[in-house]
Amino acid sequence: EVEKTACPSGKKAREIDESLIFYKKWELEACVDAALLATQMDRVNAIPFTYEQLDVLKHKLDELYPQGYPESVIQHLGYLFLKMSPEDIRKWNVTSLETLKALLEVNKGHEMSPQVATLIDRFVKGRGQLDKDTLDTLTAFYPGYLCSLSPEELSSVPPSSIWAVRPQDLDTCDPRQLDVLYPKARLAFQNMNGSEYFVKIQSFLGGAPTEDLKALSQQNVSMDLATFMKLRTDAVLPLTVAEVQKLLGPHVEGLKAEERHRPVRDWILRQRQDDLDTLGLGLQGGIPNGYLVLDLSMQEALS
């Protein structure tokens, strides 16, 4: 807490200008009117205040707005935003995408801080859903943003917003998240033709069910191994050797290098060895010829 002292003669600030960088902390406290600061916040960002001086300016704003800053001030916080705590930010009501962009710009190049996470949370909750423009903005600043959301939070993403998602935005998503996103993507891209559809849906396929993979296998899509390796194991297991061959096209040769890794390993264990041999890749570990395969899951379903 900076102690209250009278402003020295001739030092009362009439505007926020560069002369203030030479004020001591107590002089800033005594000589800068909080209301003046609030109306000229856009200037603060252009003046090389020390972090200690910024602390004083923040303190003045906190006194002026104990219930939380108005958006007109928030939009112009600039580097003063880095001084805010998540508790401060929870008091804000941020509705403008321009305000969100301005504050994300300040944090650009850094990891998502607790302050930024709180800001985004406040903004999205205020909007009620993750609309396309918001998602566009957030993934531009934080490619991993989408994958930081819970499946429950992702359920509020409208299918129309999926158009804003780039493949790299899904790099860190786990299967539970892709389970939520895939149906939305399927809906969003449903009117595209085969090859264009596959390009768009490819990065979401970690959430695709068996029947959709079977359908894709009929469309000469030539899925690459990296995509195949991200598919749900339970969705891959029921695929036949012929279906996998059609799904991968020329990339089928890559199965050999991945035969010890899931889902390829588990899929091999479910195939007849003579079917695997038709691929000519030397894949081993299939069901020996002459063995009977019982589908216990089907039996359980019937009982």
């Epitope: 001739g10 009439r14 505007e15 200008d17 560069e18 002369s19 960088i21 030479f22 200037r43 960002n45 252009a46 003046i47 090389p48 020390t50 972090y51 600039g78 580097y79 710009e105 300040v106 650009k108």
Partner: antibody, heavy 116, light 111 residues
Framework: QVQLVQSGAEVKKPGSSVKVSCKAS????????ISWVRQAPGQGLEWMGG????????NYAQKFQGRVTITADESTSTAYMELSSLRSEDTAVYYC?????????WGQGTLVTVSS | DIALTQPASVSGSPGQSITISCTGT?????????VSWYQQHPGKAPKLMIY???NRPSGVSNRFSGSKSGNTASLTISGLQAEDEADYYC???????????FGGGTKLTVL
């Protein structure tokens, strides 16, 4: 936007002094941070020092400490830069500037030639 | 007063993007989000292109952008044009010495 108009070119002998003026118009001159920046022929920009007129005290780059004096006259909205003990390597264009953050105004520059 | 370190020259063809770096210390570039970039054409006074790391003054083309990582600031010019050929200087305010510091300057040639 503030306008800064500097005094004319000077030719000086080694060992002498030169005083360059910079008159401001528009805005609140007394609160401005007026810098002096020089640029020798074919060289880069070099900050010499600066002043806020209402405070009167200037701060200087270490290199020029003791040889440069920056002052300001609030009544005429004019800043001055005096450089003493001139040597040939002080031949340069000298700029006054209000250049802090978004504030960006430069004088037209004053060529000071030091030659015997 | 140690100058900030900039490459002496960079070049690019029209339409290309170039980046000019500016390396300082933790007490200037790294310590504060206060870095400016100036453009200077021969015989002219410098012109402010970027302030506070990544802010553009009104009237400056959005082809110019700034960023900072650690003790290094960068100016990126996209869609190079012939009129971008000039000298570029970075500058920061050093709170330790209460003064400005300039980079040595970078000559940009548009091929």
């Amino acid at each position: 936007q503030v306008q800064l108009v500097q005094s004319g070119a000077e030719v000086k002998k080694p060992g002498s002094s030169v005083k360059v003026s910079c008159k401001a118009s528009g805005g609140t001159f007394s609160s401005y941070y007026i810098s002096w920046v020089r640029q020798a022929p074919g060289q880069g920009l070099e900050w010499m020092g600066g002043i806020i007129p209402k405070f009167g005290t200037a701060n200087y780059a270490q290199k020029f400490q003791g040889r440069v004096t920056i002052t300001a006259d609030e009544s005429t909205s004019t800043a001055y830069m005096e450089l003493s003990s001139l040597r040939s390597e002080d031949t340069a264009v000298y700029y006054c500037a209000r250049t802090i953050g978004i504030y960006d105004s430069w004088g037209q520059g004053t060529l000071v030639t030091v030659s015997s | 007063d140690i100058a900030l370190t900039q490459p002496a020259s960079v070049s690019g063809s029209p339409g290309q993007s170039i980046t000019i770096s500016c390396t300082g210390t933790s007490s200037d570039v790294g310590g504060y989000n206060y870095v400016s970039w100036y453009q200077q054409h021969p015989g002219k006074a410098p012109k402010l292109m970027i302030y506070s790391v990544n802010n553009r003054p009104s009237g400056v083309s959005n082809r110019f952008s700034g960023s900072k990582s650690g003790n290094t600031a960068s100016l990126t010019i996209s869609g190079l044009q012939a009129e971008d050929e000039a000298d570029y200087y970075c500058s920061t305010y050093d709170h330790t010495s209460s003064g400005f510091v300039f980079g040595g300057g970078t000559k940009l040639t548009v091929l």
